[in-house]
């Protein structure tokens, strides 16, 4: 059967600077030349798009300038980094991969990565 499976880590802890990175890997049923990667956030039953990028195989992954995501691609693996996260952004981040070209189109959706974000403690005022 020709199916597309997407794998991503179950849990990631964001850094104290609010940066979280994870790998999204997909098993491609065909030789795609154009791939779209979308990061979705699922909170309660609401799903929202965090960021998206379309790239040509062999080329670099480029998100929009104002995106909170950056990433690099290598074969069927995408290394994603989400920046500017705060405690309220803790949630399930789902990697969605679409093989856009050539036909046929294939969809792959990961099970999601639970990203935990802890806001850093404010530095106490120091008296000198």
């Amino acid at each position: 059967c020709k199916a597309m499976h997407v794998a991503q880590p179950a849990v990631v802890l964001a850094s104290s600077r609010g940066i979280a990175s994870f790998v999204c890997e997909y098993a491609s049923p065909g030789k795609a030349t154009e791939v779209r990667v979308t990061v979705l956030r699922q909170a309660d039953s609401q799903v929202t798009e965090v960021c998206a990028a379309t790239y040509m195989m062999g080329n670099e992954l480029t998100f929009l300038d104002d995106s909170i995501c950056t990433g690099t691609s290598s074969g069927n693996q995408v290394n994603l980094t989400i920046q500017g996260l705060r405690a309220m952004d803790t949630g399930l981040y789902i990697c969605k991969v679409e093989l856009m070209y050539p036909p046929p189109y294939y969809l792959g959706i990961g099970n999601g990565t639970q990203i935990y974000v802890i806001d850093p403690e404010p530095c106490p005022d120091s008296d000198f």
Epitope: C1, R36, M100, G108
Partner: antibody
């Protein structure tokens, strides 16, 4: 809230052309795949075509390939279906639908009836 | 192309009864990317279930989806008067996207 409104249906003779429009509101057009689905009188649903995101990738059902063209104008938040060389078997209610972020068509328009008859 | 077959064609039941609708695919549906829709006369379809088992926003919990591979089921645990309609399954894992022929649930 999300709304899809189709227009442009009507009665047309075989071999002629018609253009359907679907005006979308309540969401960012370029973040979703947009589809046309049709339903012949008393029959089931048939997927017709899809256009994705920036509009470069489009796919069609074999039954309409080469005759129908899907397009979109993100500045107007409008989806189109240009139907050429129409046949009697193209008679149907045509729905536009939004592809959900996690799959399935989560919002549908009310439909517009296209009748191909001499 | 994945061909979907639905059974039965018509299901005659009374309000309060349990409805079990089947959808079978000609080949395995990619990662269970299967949806169920409800359609009432003169209305557009409404998404009930996506991903074979996830309920769409606002859908009552009496609707549930299950299955994997080639065999899928939509269950309505206790039929309400407003549930009598036609139900379609659809695969969206690969193009062309295809619908089943539908199952009509009518009042016995």
């Amino acid at each position: 809230q999300v709304q899809l409104v189709e227009s442009g249906g009507g009665v047309v003779q075989p071999g002629r052309s018609l253009r359907l429009s679907c005006t979308a509101s309540g969401f960012t057009f370029s973040s979703y795949g947009m589809d046309w689905v049709r339903q012949a009188p008393g029959k089931g649903l048939e997927w017709v075509a899809v256009i994705w995101y920036d509009g470069r990738n489009k796919y069609y059902a074999d039954s309409v390939k080469g005759r129908f063209t899907i397009s979109g104008d993100s500045s107007k938040n409008t989806l189109y279906l240009q139907m050429n060389s129409l046949r009697a078997e193209d008679t149907a209610v045509y729905y536009c639908a939004r592809g959900g972020l996690l799959g399935g068509f989560d919002y549908w328009g009310q439909g517009t009836l296209v009748t191909v008859s001499s | 192309e994945i061909v979907l077959t639905q059974s039965p064609g018509t299901l005659s039941l009374s309000p309060g009864e349990r409805a079990t609708l089947s959808c079978r695919a000609s080949q395995s549906v990619s990662s269970n990317y299967l949806a169920w829709y409800q359609q009432k006369p003169g209305q557009a379809p409404r998404l009930l279930i996506y991903g074979a088992s996830s309920r769409a926003t606002g859908i009552p919990d009496r609707f549930s989806g299950s299955g994997s591979g080639t065999d899928f089921t939509l269950t309505i645990s206790r039929l309400e008067p407003e549930d009598f309609a036609v139900y379609y399954c659809q695969q969206y894992g690969s193009s062309p996207f295809t619908f089943g022929p539908g199952t009509k649930v009518d009042i016995k």
